[in-house]
């Protein structure tokens, strides 16, 4: 988590705080989900490894008009050191599987929680 710009704060946000807020937001999305998230929009699945934050943003940024994930998109931009725009796939090494946004969020959440439990947030 090298770049933490993009968060509305007076100073730098400690990595653990920023990651916590991302997890909290993903938890809120999964717990408050009633209708299909983002109308069942499909996004590219990603490898949850190095460069995951940029890859996640590049995948989710192609979903438009979905207010439920706008905050997540903003938060992910704070973890990605380069500007990401729709249709950009420089971090998405493998583009062979599309999944629903709801499943994408769930997979990302599970992985981030595991990183945090292991103390790997720096």
């Amino acid at each position: 988590l090298t770049c933490l710009g993009g968060f509305a704060s007076p100073g730098p946000v400690p990595p653990s705080t920023a990651l916590r807020e991302l997890i909290e937001e993903l938890v809120n999305i999964t717990q408050n989900q009633k209708a299909p998230l983002c109308n069942g929009s499909m996004v590219w699945s990603i490898n949850l490894t190095a460069g995951m934050y940029c890859a996640a943003l590049e995948s989710l940024i192609n979903v438009s008009g979905c207010s439920a994930i706008e905050k997540t998109q903003r938060m992910l931009s704070g973890f990605c050191p380069h500007k990401v725009s729709a249709g950009q796939f420089s971090s998405l090494h493998v583009r062979d599987t599309k999944i629903e946004v709801a499943q994408f969020v769930k997979d990302l959440l599970l992985h981030l929680k595991k990183l945090f439990r292991e103390g790997q947030f720096n």
Epitope: S16, T17, R20, E21, I23, E24, V27, K113, K114, F116, R117, E118, G119
Partner: antibody, heavy 123, light 111 residues
Framework: EVQLVESGPALVKPTQTLTLTCTFS??????????VGWIRQPPGKALEWLAH???????RYNPALKSRLTISKDTSKNQVVLTMTNMDPVDTATYYC???????????????WGQGTLVTVSS | DIVMTQSPDSLAVSLGERATINCRAS??????????MNWYQQKPGQPPKLLIK???NLESGVPDRFSGSGSGTDFTLTISSLQAEDVAVYYC?????????FGQGTKVEIK
């Protein structure tokens, strides 16, 4: 109903290894976001977190005691075991096991506790 | 390590009166949405019991005379109308990072 029961020796000698077992019921350590921790309390003193283990076998230890502690689980037996090496009289305390009751699946707070077992370290 | 400091160390309150316990963390344990601060009650000879999690969320079955507040580094546990069964030692605990630490405890007695 959630229950946790600690078992182990009431008396250990200095330099010996303490092995404590937490046997629980009412929940499963194979369930996502579930975990079990150990906390101790010297007589008349405050609580000290020692270690905990998550359903997916992620283990965390108090850095001040990490070299002496090992935590493990046996999901099929509903048990969590803590070992503590090189016991010293200052380790005399009531040792509690407790279930982690997190909302988020990564932070450890403890919503159910065992009655505790008093361990005295003396020669 | 995050140091948790409770005040006062002991407190004597008349039955039916308000009891207030403070807990200060040596660094912030809050995000913009949640505070990773928990409160426990320990009666003599018993294990601790979780009262409040995430600073203000009352645990199921806990009487509503107990409440928690605060964010950042400063937190408060309030018993709005002290009952005889509330005599105990109360501990705060952060769940922000390893190692999870507890306050030294506040003993609440009847005046």
């Amino acid at each position: 109903e959630v229950q946790l029961v600690e078992s182990g020796p009431a008396l250990v000698k200095p330099t010996q290894t303490l092995t404590l077992t937490c046997t629980f019921s009412g929940f499963s350590l194979s369930t996502s976001d579930m975990g079990v921790g150990w906390i101790r309390q010297p007589p008349g003193k405050a609580l000290e977190w020692l270690a905990h283990i998550w359903w997916d076998d992620v283990k965390r230890y108090n850095p001040a005691l990490k070299s002496r502690l090992t935590i493990s689980k046996d999901t099929s037996k509903n048990q969590v075991v803590l070992t503590m090496t090189n016991m010293d009289p200052v380790d005399t305390a009531t040792y509690y096991c407790a279930r982690i009751g997190t909302n988020y699946g990564y932070d450890a707070l403890f919503d159910y506790w065992g009655q505790g077992t008093l361990v005295t370290v003396s020669s | 390590d995050i140091v948790m400091t409770q005040s006062p160390d002991s407190l004597a309150v008349s039955l039916g009166e308000r009891a207030t316990i403070n807990c200060r963390a040596s660094q912030s344990v809050s995000t913009s949405s949640y505070s990773y601060m928990n409160w426990y009650q320990q009666k003599p000879g018993q294990p601790p019991k979780l009262l409040i999690k995430y600073a203000s969320n009352l645990e199921s079955g806990v009487p509503d005379r107990f409440s928690g507040s605060g964010s950042g580094t400063d937190f408060t546990l309030t018993i709005s109308s002290l009952q005889a069964e509330d005599v105990a030692v109360y501990y705060c605990q952060h769940s922000w990072e390893i190692p999870y630490t507890f306050g030294q405890g506040t003993k609440v007695e009847i005046k």
